[in-house]
Interface confidence: medium
């Protein structure tokens, strides 16, 4: 009868960090620089990612792992492993699934990033609108008319507006 | 009243097309978010099938999914469907449809904000 | 495939507990925070609690509380109620050649 012979692959035992170098009868040399293997048996290693231009360096390359990028200040990232840097949204937008858009009347955004809150609604504090809202600043209240006595505040700040949490129907 | 609303058969046999109806209620399909489906099989966790944009009818599948599933709209109804072709014991599962929250420019936010109350497809002979 | 891991999968807690759940994906959500928040109980759809990241939806009791960016996100209930033993989920949305969702496993909570 024939027995069968266990035929290991002597690249298997190369570790991460090292590839199984054809060239030196199938030895474990380390990765050269600038590359890196994040498994073991592999038989060449893995170029380092750059980050360059808009991309700046998250986590820098070792040996066992790819460097990760994020994107330099005014940029965000999107897609997997920030693959894309895209410019942030401006004051008055927020960010959606078709890119940087308006806040519609009624809400507000003055930042960068995050998403357009309505504005707060003066009169369930009682108090009256002393400035208007815009696309990049929420409404100031102000003294509602039977608070305008000598000594009365004249300016509140506006409560903390929350977003609805749903589509507008 | 917003709501959503399942709707097919309870029971698919084996290597069959599974085929639900989302009804659509209280608002209507004019904005650019998504409408999805969502299943649990029984006693276990969510899993994402796929979504369809309403404004352009662009189409998205889970990995597992694609070559399996259509997901289509019919805005004179307003409703959408799924459609899970070549079913197993595996696709036995609570099957939810869900919207995607607009943002207050009516544009996809990428979380689910209404959900129906789901339908239990059972894949058996 | 995107692989979105909550920990711990359950946990028991009494009422009054500080509760706090993880979600860890394999690659970072859209715009680093596109990652939401879901309460199930059973029979029932689940219900947001939190999107974005760390924004409350409508609703939704102040005890819970969201944070994290990129990879790493937790949901805190700073004092547990009685209505609040249920299974909670993560959601990530993500880009890369196209639009893509993903849940987490899911953590259950009951009562100690």
């Known amino acids: 009868f024939e027995r069968t012979r266990s035929l290991q692959d002597p690249c298997s035992n190369c570790p991460a960090g090292t590839f199984c170098d054809n060239n030196r009868n199938q030895i474990c040399s380390p990765c050269p620089p600038n590359s890196f293997s994040s498994a073991g048996g592999q038989r060449t290693c893995d170029i380092c990612r750059q980050c360059k231009g808009v991309f700046r360096t998250r986590k820098e390359c070792s040996s066992t792992s790819n460097a990760e990028c994020d994107c330099t200040p005014g940029f965000h990232c999107l897609g997997a492993g920030c693959s894309m840097c895209e410019q942030d949204c401006k004051q008055g937008q927020e960010l959606t699934k078709k890119g940087c858009k308006d806040c519609c009347f009624g809400t507000f955004n003055d930042q960068k990033r995050g998403i357009c809150r309505p504005w707060t609604n003066c009169s369930l504090d009682g108090k009256s609108v002393l400035v208007n809202g815009t696309k990049e600043r929420d409404v100031v209240c102000g003294p509602s008319p039977a608070d305008l006595s000598p000594g009365a505040s004249s300016v509140t700040p506006p409560a903390p507006a929350r977003e609805p949490g749903h589509s507008p129907q | 009243q917003v709501q959503l609303q399942e709707s097919g058969p309870g029971l698919v046999k084996p290597s069959e097309t599974l085929s639900l109806t989302c009804k659509v209620s209280g608002f209507s399909f004019n904005n650019d978010y998504d409408m999805c489906w969502i299943r649990q099989p029984p006693g276990k966790g969510l899993e994402w099938i796929g979504c369809?944009?309403?404004?352009?009818?662009?189409?998205y599948y889970a990995s597992w999914a694609k070559g399996r599933v259509t997901i289509s709209v019919d805005s004179s109804k307003n409703q959408f469907s799924l459609k899970l072709s070549s079913v197993t014991a595996a696709d036995t599962a609570v099957y939810y449809c869900a919207r995607e929250a607009a943002s207050s420019s009516g544009y996809g936010m990428g979380y689910f904000d209404l959900w129906g109350q789901g339908t239990l497809v059972t894949v058996s002979s | 495939d995107i692989q979105m891991t909550q920990s711990p999968s359950s946990l028991s807690a009494s009422v009054g507990d500080r509760v706090t759940i993880t979600c860890q994906s394999s690659?970072?959500?859209?715009?680093?925070?596109?990652l939401a928040w879901y309460q199930q109980k059973p029979g029932k759809a689940p219900k947001l609690l939190i999107y974005?990241?760390?924004n409350l939806a409508s609703g939704v009791p102040s005890r819970f509380s969201g944070s994290g960016s990129g990879t790493d996100f937790t949901l805190t209930i700073s004092s547990l109620q009685p209505e609040d033993f249920a299974t909670y989920y993560c959601?990530?949305?993500?880009?890369?050649?196209?639009?893509?969702?993903?849940f987490g496993t899911g953590t259950k909570v009951t009562v100690l």
């Open positions: 959601q990530g949305t993500y880009l890369s050649s196209n639009w893509y969702w993903a």
């Open positions: 690659q970072s959500v859209y715009d680093n925070n596109w």
């Open positions: 369809i944009d309403t404004g352009d009818g662009s189409t």
């Open positions: 974005r990241a760390s």
